[in-house]
Amino acid sequence: WELTILHTNDVHSRLEQTSEDSSKCVNASRCMGGVARLFTKVQQIRRAEPNVLLLDAGDQYQGTIWFTVYKGAEVAHFMNALRYDAMALGNHEFDNGVEGLIEPLLKEAKFPILSANIKAKGPLASQISGLYLPYKVLPVGDEVVGIVGYTSKETPFLSNPGTNLVFEDEITALQPEVDKLKTLNVNKIIALGHSGFEMDKLIAQKVRGVDVVVGGHSNTFLYTGNPPSKEVPAGKYPFIVTSDDGRKVPVVQAYAFGKYLGYLKIEFDERGNVISSHGNPILLNSSIPEDPSIKADINKWRIKLDNYSTQELGKTIVYLDGSSQSCRFRECNMGNLICDAMINNNLRHTDEMFWNHVSMCILNGGGIRSPIDERNNGTITWENLAAVLPFGGTFDLVQLKGSTLKKAFEHSVHRYGQSTGEFLQVGGIHVVYDLSRKPGDRVVKLDVLCTKCRVPSYDPLKMDEVYKVILPNFLANGGDGFQMIKDELLRHDSGDQDINVVSTYISKMKVIYPAVEGRIKFS
């Protein structure tokens, strides 16, 4: 019996087609992805093959103005239209709190939404009961397939699930659910979830009875043969893990942003054992036409977005200096504003010992692309912010050693004075440079804001200590020459859309007046 698994993960609000780098589509003839194009390919496969499942491994939420405006209603509507068979909860599904998940998505989805390792307690338990499931048995042709879900247990540090959801260890939570399915004579089981490729492989190795793992969170690109675009494969597709009980378990993921449709064919014997597995992600490029009815629906929903981008978010009573002349040479108040917004967006009081889990922000000055003039009645709109942050990136959470941070700050000024983009703006950090010293030895003082303290204060950076830092995904990926961050980071979790972070902060503050306050000094 043959099953075709079509899968997406980490789509992050890319409902419309995008450029090759998953930013806003500029030249339509070269654009990729989007739900209209995805639907064309899915329908083509559904017509050609008998047993097809369309699965999503989480993080549909967050990433473009679509999510900012529609808050998840767009996810339910278009996933219903594409007739997804199941979805796992990702960490970003909790970005607007549990209510922001229940109302727009859980109550509206016509497909099961899954996670076995999230347990509700207190008053939420009855409210959310039955709205998401640990597993769902689905009819596929004349057979049945069990889908069991899982979600990153780091979600409380990455999003806003509140205090009434407990995120358990994935493997510990999955095993009894898989055992239950086996007891119920369900002998074909897919683990669908959002914990990253390393955990996907562990699940394949450790959870007895799981036949296939379909993952997300780490934006992992797997491919067999010559890759069709810019993404470099982390391994073959499918990635085969030998389980502790000796089975070959295929593990798949399909990069991110709806650029590819994962395509995996699995052959099972009559006892539900995997005999063979093969496939590859399908690049959703312009050779695949956009479905006209879905496209018309997208255009209809788009109207509200255009109206939103010119509405006032808040006011500034000072000039927001985002000029290259400032942000690439010294502390600029636009950099301070953005870093303050980044920290504010990551406030999670999950431990009495810590006032927050992260206090530091770094931001490449070259990523700040425009100032905002306060003389337009102080008005700040989404459109204004899109000029400041035009690249459609995210503000991510990483863990780095102090020594790596020191290298990053040396790199920040290694060729100072040439208006290059690597000059770092900061939050929760006090840095002093001496430019008379030779490159690589110019940081004379580097103090960081404590987190394990009731009264935050600045202490010298410790080289061997591990620190959490919020930074643009561009830096996490080694952009602007920050290779040491990419090479030495200990953990990397994708965060929220950059403009969304700043716009939410401005809306919350209502009136802003960021200052230049001595975060960056020269001796």
Partner: nanobody
């Protein structure tokens, strides 16, 4: 081989009663949410009544509330639908369905999600 077999259908006069049975073979109904659905000619299949395996909570469509009663006998691995005060509009093929997933009875009956196991159906005619 897993099977759901419905029985008890037939021809009955308006105001009459019937008791439908759904017997399972190949699996234990204790662990399943069970539903009765019906399909009249030219109409969509609709959920009539559902019962859970765990807490025996029940759900009834508005059109049958107060007239139909769902029950289960786990020892006999059978679920029943007692239908009283039957009306001509109750005429349909009645199907039994089962889902081992922990769905709510309401979600099962709507049905919100695809249901994996179905019987062949039994005809009920009220005239």
């Amino acid at each position: 081989q897993r099977q759901l077999v419905e029985s008890g259908g037939g021809l009955v006069q308006p105001g009459g009663s019937l008791r439908l049975s759904c017997a399972a073979s190949g699996f234990l109904l204790d662990y399943y949410v069970i539903g009765w659905f019906r399909q009249a000619p030219g109409k969509e299949r609709e959920g009539v009544s559902c019962i859970s395996g765990s807490d025996r909570s029940t759900y009834y469509a508005d059109s049958v509330k107060g007239r139909f009663t769902i029950s289960r006998d786990n020892a006999k691995n059978t679920v029943y639908l007692q239908m009283n005060s039957l009306k001509p509009e109750d005429t349909a093929v009645y199907f039994c369905a089962a889902d081992p997933s922990p769905v709510t009875v309401q979600a099962m009956c709507l049905p919100r999600f695809p249901v994996p196991y179905w019987g062949q159906g039994t005809q009920v005619t009220v005239s």
